[in-house]
Interface confidence: low
């Protein structure tokens, strides 16, 4: 008769570092001990006739153990495969680019330690919850590729990688870890420069707007500008309006950057730079100053007129060039009544680059003089009727202006000047018109005839 | 540990200028962003600009345009701000922040510096 | 600018009480690449604002759960499940899709 031994329980399968409990039991009436053949930490729990009971601990990889026994003088044997599961201990996604070309392909890695059965274990990359590769586990430490093509869409998007240990068929459920996720920022630059809007000419410590633009970037958000004048840096403002980037600044030139610059404009996004170059002119153009030698001069004195301006600067006085640019225009008069008043121009002109540039300046020039009344305009013998209505016109100058009085000889009657007034008879007589300033007095006579009006 | 150590209060004449600095440590200074922040009694919390350390290049509120000036010293980890022409309304406290691209939130945030202007 | 408005102004509750916190934005917080750039912040007296959740609902390293962010486009709301000690302080949204970034009001909560 042929007895057996069997081994419970049969082809176990547990997680990394369990513990196991296995009977060994046989239906020989006369066997010995029976002994249990393992690699594995074991302990005698228990035995009777035809049974034994023994404890495994800390079962950490796949195992055979064997039962024997003697029976009638033969040994018999039983055996038992222990499968043994564990979850991986990383599960690693690689760092992706800092900054991913749209329409370009990338690599994901994922690196997987440890995970037991591999047979069982298959590793997913994924796209937010999309999957882009599913693949077994196999080598130690597994290693796992897909190449993606990079998107608009995928900027901002997670990827990540997780693995899958089915022991499903087994009963024990499917177990899922994921790695951290890694967030993708991809970038669409044009090839083409940046549209540069900035003056062909910038006068010293003058200040004018320059506008860098660059269309077809994206994320517009993202790019940095770099906006400057020689090797001074611009203060820019930047402004997105969906894929358009502008970026404003203010260009002020400093006295020591005179003669030619470049304007510079440089946009960088995802490590790579768009750069576009403007030429300036940095001018200095002072003046023209135009001065007199006595801004208020007395009737018959001399006077200089100057009119002076920058080195370079051709200038000219009442049409009257200097002798060369760089030097001053000058001229010089007696002062007289008639040049109370009269303004003096100069024109400046300055070559930048091929282009003139004019600018032009004034001074007024005040003279001096006693009063005077123009005879002209008063007339020294009137003959108006009675009860009509007239106006004295008698005018008087000088610098400072005079005032001008009519006084009737013998009273301290007084006629308006310049104002419409009934005349009657008593207006009859001489006057003294007086035309006084700080500058002295001036007299003319004036007589009045008043013709009594006569009703027949 | 990522740490932002910024400089002590300052106390200014109006019409004056104030540097103030943020010193980052425990993480690479060039991979984020430096922000500031401005808190005021009666303005809350107010964001000033941004500067991105690797390339030096700046974004500001226009509100603090010619007021702010953000610069970095890539060789000491360390961010400055000057504010130029104080005036009383520039009372507050300032606090530099830094932001990863993501999540693009301020992350980590100094323990502000206060400047008080004052005749 | 996008001008953020929190309600309300001051929120006195219980500890263990639940609380809520809103926040609207004047224009829509959706970036171009389809990623909402709202976040939430607290400041503890005499401290420095920290981050709780970033970009509406993910919270930040060492934020508790009790912590909750949710919302879309213009509105959005932060919700704490059970209010502790340890909470107690001033909350500012703040928004960076757009330029300049902006920060709501704030809300104090408070002990009853």
């Known amino acids: 008769q042929e007895f057996l031994l069997r081994v419970e329980p049969q082809n176990p399968v547990l997680s990394a570092g369990g513990s196991l409990f296995v009977n060994c039991s046989t239906d020989c009436p006369s066997s010995e001990k029976i002994a249990l053949e393992t690699s594995l930490s074991k302990e005698l729990v228990a035995s009777g006739m035809g049974w034994a009971a023994f404890n495994l601990s800390n079962v950490t990889g796949n195992s055979r153990i064997l039962c024997s026994v003697y029976c009638n003088g033969s040994q018999i044997t039983g055996s038992s495969n222990i499968t043994v599961y564990g979850l991986p201990e990383r599960v690693e996604l690689a760092p992706l680019p800092p900054w991913q070309p749209v329409g370009q392909n990338f690599t994901l890695r994922c690196q997987v330690e440890g995970g037991s059965p591999r047979t069982s274990l298959t590793v997913v990359l994924l796209r937010w919850e999309e999957e882009l590769s599913r693949q077994p586990a196999v080598e130690e430490p597994a290693e796992v590729t897909a190449t993606v093509l990079a998107s608009r869409d995928d900027h901002g998007a997670p990827f990540s990688c997780r693995t899958e240990l089915d022991m499903q068929p087994q009963g024990l459920g499917l177990f899922v870890n994921t790695s951290a996720p890694r967030q993708l920022r991809t970038f669409v630059l044009p090839v083409t420069p940046p549209r540069l809007v900035a003056p062909r000419f910038l006068e010293v410590e003058t200040s004018w707007p320059v506008d860098c633009t660059l269309d077809g970037l994206f994320p517009a958000s993202e790019a940095q500008v770099y906006l400057a004048l020689g090797d001074q840096m611009l203060n820019a403002t930047v402004m997105n309006h969906g894929d358009t980037l502008t970026a404003t600044a203010t260009a002020t030139a400093r006295a020591d950057q005179e003669g030619a610059r470049e304007i510079v404009c440089n946009v960088t996004l995802g490590g790579e730079r768009r750069e576009a170059r403007e030429n300036l002119t940095v001018f200095s153009f002072l003046g023209p100053i135009v001065n007199l030698s006595e801004p208020t001069a007395h009737e018959g004195s001399t006077v200089t007129v100057s009119c002076m301006a920058g080195a370079r600067v051709q200038v000219t006085l009442d049409g009257v060039p200097a002798a060369a640019p760089g030097q001053t225009a000058q001229l010089q008069l007696n002062a007289t009544e008639s040049d109370d008043g009269r303004s003096f121009f100069c024109s400046a002109t300055l070559e930048v680059d091929g282009e003139f540039l004019h600018r032009n300046s004034s001074v007024q020039l005040r003279v001096l003089y006693g009063p005077k009344i123009d005879r002209a305009t008063c007339p020294q013998h009137l003959k108006w009727k009675d009860k009509t209505r007239h106006v004295l016109q008698c005018q008087a100058r000088g610098n400072p202006y005079p005032e001008l009085r009519c006084l009737k000889e013998g009273s301290s009657r007084e006629v308006p000047v310049g104002i419409p007034f009934f005349v009657n008879v008593t207006h009859n007589g001489t006057y003294q018109c007086q035309a006084s300033s700080s500058r002295g007095k001036y007299t003319l006579v004036v007589v009045m005839d008043i013709e009594a009006f006569s009703s027949h | 540990e990522v740490q932002l150590q910024q400089s002590g209060p300052e106390l200014v004449k109006p019409g004056a200028s104030v540097k103030i600095s943020c010193k980052a440590s425990g993480y690479t200074f060039t991979d984020c962003i430096i922000l500031w922040v401005k808190q005021s009694h009666g303005k809350g919390l107010e964001w000033i600009g941004k500067i991105n350390p690797y390339f030096g290049t700046t974004t500001y509120n226009l509100k603090f345009k010619g007021k702010a000036t953000l610069t970095v010293d890539k060789s000491s980890s360390t961010a400055h701000m000057q504010l130029n022409s104080l005036t009383s309304e520039d009372s507050a406290v300032y606090y530099c922040?830094?932001?990863?691209?993501?999540?693009?939130?301020?992350?980590?945030w100094g323990q502000g510096t206060s400047v008080t202007v004052s005749s | 600018d996008a001008v953020m408005t929190q309600t309300p102004l001051s929120l006195p509750v219980s500890l263990g009480d639940q609380a809520s916190i809103s926040c609207r934005s004047s224009q829509s917080l959706v970036h171009s690449n389809g990623d909402t750039y709202l976040h939430w912040y607290l400041q503890k007296p005499g401290q420095s604002p920290q981050l709780l959740i970033y970009?509406?609902?993910n919270r930040f390293s060492g934020v508790p759960d009790r912590f909750s962010g949710s919302g879309s486009g213009t509105d959005f709301t932060l919700k704490l499940s059970r209010v502790e000690a340890e909470d107690l302080g001033v909350y500012f949204c703040s928004q960076s899709t757009h330029v300049p970034y902006t920060f709501g009001g704030g809300t104090k909560l408070e002990i009853k």
């Open positions: 922040a830094r932001k990863e691209a993501y999540p693009d939130a301020m992350d980590y």
């Open positions: 970009k509406v609902s």
